[in-house]
């Protein structure tokens, strides 16, 4: 049993059909000795007196939050969560499997630049009763700081028979060296409780692997004299990393017409404009990687060629 | 040339071939399958390479005060690859296909540390370790961790020579 | 899934006892609350008594006269049936439920339970 925050404690549960459970022993913060009774939840029946309760805890009927009284007088709460293992592996009921990029990936994480700011998501069909604070750090034995915000849910889908709802967190490091290589991961870990289950996640990744630029900006066409050429020009987008002279994008340009079946066109530019014909009724379209780090491309920016 | 005096490098010249390497590391190492190499327990074969570190004067301003710190720094990781991509994890088994980009890699790096480093002129290198796996599939992960972490530095080096050409060329 | 077996109903005489069991297996971490429940013929299945840890609740009907109780080890819940009237004739069903509310009095409502045993036959002769 350990401490998650302030009268909250998590029992782990290695749970096999036949396990014992756990025994755990509940003592009332108080200085006071003789007239004490327990409960549990919002029952008034009273489970046993005295200053401390041993219970066995075997399923998740056994946690709950357990309080100390006397004379009527609340003393103490102690609420008890489960973190349950079962054959040698911590259940992961409350988030979704995303499945990318690769199986059991259950926090996602990007950032735009290499400001050391990142922001990560996740995935439940679980609508009440939830709750998930986030810790962050740069490497491990000896961590250092990043800052987290409250996760928010996000969004909301519907799939299928199934409501979805995405929650985010924003992280910041503390002391962030956008130039420098980095050598220790950043570790984020989410705590997850769902009434009285409570389940733990991580992810572990270098800023490098997670940068996602935004879209180029102010994607605008000039259509060429006495040809059916336009020179097509972009801008960095504004929350990518200062200067563009260090930090570099490269782009790829793209002429699609109206039939996703029709040959798309592409270029790959180093520069913020490129010469492409357009054809009637196609669009122009630009995303941008890192020029020397192979992460993913942004989303596309588009334009009609008309 | 960098000369350890203090003079410039052919900033234009060292981008371009940064620029390159950035390419044939990523043609030797693709993202294989998002194949997590961190999760391999690698601390004792890549925590010995040379990164570039905060410290170290890489960044724009650090550049503009005095390249040579970065400059020192990015030669000692060129070498210290170099010898790696020389040494029996590439050059044992399984062997390489014929057409790997290792061996251009492993030339370009060459390259580039001569472009910072004349002859006759010597920086301090870092030693490289003892890495001598037995089994050919240790040496494999192995290939896979030293790319993935060259990735990385030749990235830092490629923006430092890129921002050198545009912002300290004479 | 969560399995439930009842077992120990007959016939007894009228002010006589008996003791039923209902033996879980299956994924029973998942449990929150265990009942029993009875139907006579004729009429709808209703609530006898519910247990969750150390909490018991009954039904006005059977307070003082049955005691719910839970063997952890065993993963068994037991309704002893003392002084039994011909009115406790019926099949009793032991159920389960995997859902938390933390009002233990919800664990007397039928739907609050998503597993149910195939139910044992009790019958007093008067």
């Known amino acids: 049993i350990w401490e998650l925050k302030k009268d909250v404690y998590v029992v782990e549960l290695d749970w096999y059909p036949d396990a014992p459970g756990e025994m755990v022993v509940l003592t009332c913060d108080t200085p006071e000795e003789d007239g004490i009774t327990w409960t549990l939840d919002q029952s008034s029946e009273v489970l046993g007196s005295g200053k401390t309760l041993t219970i066995q805890v075997k399923e998740f009927g056994d946690a709950g939050q357990y309080t100390c009284h006397k004379g009527g007088e609340v003393l103490s709460h102690s609420l008890l969560l489960l973190h349950k293992k079962e054959d040698g592996i911590w259940s992961t009921d409350i988030l979704k499997d995303q499945k990318e990029p690769k199986n059991k990936t259950f926090l996602r994480c990007e950032a735009k630049n290499y400001s050391g700011r990142f922001t990560c998501w996740w995935l439940t069909t679980i609508s009440t009763d939830l709750t998930f604070s986030v810790k962050s750090s740069r490497g491990s034995s000896d961590p250092q700081g990043v800052t987290c915000g409250a996760a928010t849910l996000s969004a909301e889908r519907v799939r299928g028979d199934n409501k979805e709802y995405e929650y985010s967190v924003e992280c910041q490091e503390d002391s962030a060296c956008p130039a420098a290589e980095e050598s220790l991961p950043i570790e984020v870990m989410v705590d997850a409780v769902h009434k009285l289950k409570y389940e733990n996640y991580t992810s572990s990744f270098f800023i490098r692997d997670i940068i996602k630029p935004d879209p180029p900006k102010n994607l605008q066409l000039k259509p060429l004299k006495n040809s059916r050429q336009v020179e097509v020009s972009w801008e960095y987008p504004d929350t990518w990393s200062t200067p563009h002279s260090y930090f570099s994008l490269t782009f790829c340009v793209q002429v699609q017409g109206k039939s996703k079946r029709e040959k798309k066109d592409r270029v790959f530019t180093d520069k913020t404009s490129a010469t492409v014909i357009c054809r009637k009724n196609a669009s122009i379209s630009v995303r941008a990687q890192d020029r020397y780090y192979s992460s993913s491309w942004s989303e596309w920016a588009s334009v009609p060629c008309s | 040339r960098a000369v350890p005096g203090g003079s410039s490098p052919a900033w234009t010249q060292c981008q371009q071939l940064s620029q390159k390497l950035c390419t044939l590391a990523w043609s030797a190492h693709p993202l294989v399958g998002h194949m997590d190499l961190r999760e391999e327990g690698d601390e004792e074969t890549t925590n010995d390479v040379p990164h570039i570190q905060c410290g170290d004067g890489c960044d724009p301003q650090g550049l503009r005060d005095n390249s040579q710190f970065c400059l020192q720094r990015i030669h000692q990781g060129l070498i210290f690859y170099e010898k790696l991509l020389g040494s029996d994890i590439f050059t044992g088994e399984p062997s390489l296909l014929p057409d790997s980009p290792v061996g251009q890699l492993h030339a370009s790096l060459l390259g580039l540390s001569q472009l910072l480093q004349p002859e006759g002129h010597h920086w301090e290198t870092q030693q490289i370790p003892s890495l001598s796996p037995s089994q050919p599939w240790q040496r494999l992960l192995l290939r896979f961790k030293i790319l993935r972490s060259l990735q990385a530095f030749v990235a830092v080096a490629a923006r430092v020579f890129a921002h050198g050409a545009a912002t300290l060329s004479p | 899934e969560v399995q439930l077996v009842e077992s120990g109903g007959g016939l007894v005489q009228a002010g006589g006892s008996l003791r039923l069991s209902c033996a879980s297996s299956g994924r029973t971490f998942s449990i929150y609350a265990r009942g029993w429940f009875r139907q006579a013929p004729g009429k709808e299945r209703e609530f006898v008594a519910a247990?969750?840890?150390?909490?018991?609740t009954y039904s006005d009907s059977v307070k003082g006269r049955f005691t719910i109780s839970r063997d952890i080890a065993k993963n068994t819940v037991f309704l002893q049936m003392n002084s039994l009237k011909s009115e406790d004739t019926a099949v009793y069903y032991c159920?389960?439920?995997?859902?938390?509310?933390?009002?233990?009095?919800?664990?007397?409502?039928?739907?609050?339970?998503?597993?149910w045993g195939q139910g044992t036959q009790v019958t007093v002769s008067s």
């Open positions: 247990i969750r840890s150390g909490l018991t």
């Open positions: 159920a389960a439920a995997v859902n938390y509310f933390t009002d233990f009095t919800d664990y007397s409502k039928r739907d609050s339970y998503d597993y």
